[in-house]
Amino acid sequence: VTCDDYYYGFGCNKFCRPRDDFFGHYACDQNGNKTCMEGWMGPECNRAICRQGCSPKHGSCKLPGDCRCQYGWQGLYCD
């Protein structure tokens, strides 16, 4: 059985479209499961992995490897 584009699995009922945009950064494996691109995490692969050591409480990142501090916090790790 050949599935339509972006459909996978037995019965072709698993849908996965690779994307690399605001809504996700992932490829699809042979079973139609998302595999996050390097630097991204979460079920939709749309959460950037911040700089190692970045404070989870006082820092965040829009892009992988960043560490942007909340107001009132500073330093390489916002700690």
Epitope: D4, D21, F23, N46, A48, C50, S60
Partner: antibody
Amino acid sequence: QVQLVQSGAELKKPGSSVKVSCKASGYTFTDYEMHWVRQAPGQGLEWMGAIQPGGGGTAYAQKFKGRVTLTADKSTSTAYMELSSLRSEDTAVYYCTRRGYDDYPFAYWGQGTLVTVSS
Amino acid sequence: DIQMTQSPSSLSASVGDRVTITCRASGNIHNYLAWYQQKPGKAPKLLIYNAKTLADAVPSRFSGSGSGTDYTLTISSLQPEDFATYYCQHFWSAPWTFGQGTKLEIK
């Protein structure tokens, strides 16, 4: 279960701003972007934009760029939509909405917030 | 931006009728299409996603089909609770635009 609870109705003057909140529960707030959709009385649905609460990244419909600001507070799992320079045409119900799991579109919706703009 | 054109804008039908609503995208959206049902004063409810997959707890009388730019929502046998407004929406790329809606009324 996933729940999105929005703030109450607002009556605003033309030229002012409004800030609508959407408190999320039942899932990890930073895992999914929060979208905002509005519906003017008797009209259709209009996508305004979305925010990724984890890092604060945003995407806006061209029509609203410069006038809408989406923010999120991770500590309270609350998303906010602020619309400035209000005019009568902005009178609408504003919804926050979230994708479902595994690439669904908008499976979860807030109850809606009516914003009335009138002098 | 991809535009969605939905037809008809309104439709009168009777309980038991088979009803079809169509949605045309201005570009290929690769099955990234959803259908919603909305009743007055309520938030929209997801019916179908990825063009043909029924959302949780949606009755099997609803079905979706299509590919490329042309998509269809079919209700095989109308029930009283189906009278509502229906919207299509693409989610291929931002902005995720909606069709203008189809109001389904009792004949």
